[in-house]
Interface confidence: medium
């Protein structure tokens, strides 16, 4: 079976002038997934990103996350890129607090 992930991009204050943007993928199966941040369409160097392990979420599906710190005001330059079960999608940083996008394949 294949269950596409719910992708949830959030932002939080990190330090003055900076914010942390976190991209969470949840409720997906199988557990194999790729999640990474891009700036202006180009993948960020992985040493500027932090990943969570892929963990079961208790419903027979999985969850994980990737986060990076960016300059406040540059949110529109960043997107979260996701690959799962041969499909891919990109997800922008929300202008508000939370944006939830369901992938439809």
């Amino acid at each position: 079976r294949r269950v596409p992930p719910m992708v949830n991009v959030t932002r939080s204050e990190a330090s003055e002038g900076n914010i942390t943007v976190t991209c969470r993928a949840s409720s997906f199966y199988p557990r194999n997934i790729t999640l990474t941040w891009r700036q202006d369409g180009v993948s960020l160097s992985h040493d500027t990103q932090q990943w969570g392990d892929v963990l079961p979420d208790g419903n027979g599906t999985y969850q994980t996350w990737v986060a990076t710190r960016i300059c406040q005001g540059e949110e529109q330059r960043f997107t979260c890129y996701m690959e799962h079960s041969g499909n891919h999608s990109t997800h922008p940083v929300p202008s508000g607090k939370v944006l939830v996008l369901q992938s439809h394949w």
Epitope: R31, T34, H46, E83, H84, S85
Partner: antibody, heavy 119, light 108 residues
Amino acid sequence: QVQLKQSGPGLVQPSQSLSITCIVSGFSLTTYGVHWVRQSPGKGLEWLGMIWTDGTTDYNAAFISRLSINKDNSKSQVFLKMNSLQADDTGIYYCVRKGHGYYYAMDYWGQGTSVTVSS
Amino acid sequence: QILLTQSPAILSASLGERVTMTCTASSSVSSSYLHWYQQKPGSSPKLWIYSTSNLASGVPARFSGGGSGTSYSLTVSNMEAEDAATYYCHQYHRSPFTFGSGTKLEIK
């Protein structure tokens, strides 16, 4: 059956460019990313860069100024071009499939292209 | 960049022996992004163990992997002749994504 077949020159003159083509079969480049890795006696295995399913590229910072990776999905071909080769670029160059969710592990390797940089 | 140090460089083992090789990272690596490859002379490397402890397709169950943080290992519980090869650890945690220098496992 997954295969990655490489073609390219065995001998490159110093300061010249290297071009290698990787032709894949048994999978689609719209579904899998491809890495390039090289192996040399002096430096061992080195990751050069990769191209994602959507065509975005990641490069090793040590090579970013002289390396480009491109692909043609319709022809199932991935291309590596490296400029300004020197003797220490001698080695075996591999194209490698990025495994699905194997956390960027490399699950199928090409046969390798042996490259000697010499005049 | 993260330096991966493999030890020993050469490991000699008798058939049937249990052997362990190690991979030490210069800074912490997520266990999800630590992999092992097997390479035999004249051949391309093969994915052997992914994400620290998961055996790739076709890898015999006598192989196992473990570890976390900066210390990882690959173990062969019952050495067989076909296991003679060089094993490389690889991290995809931080760019540039690096490989260890390899442990050559040979038959004593």
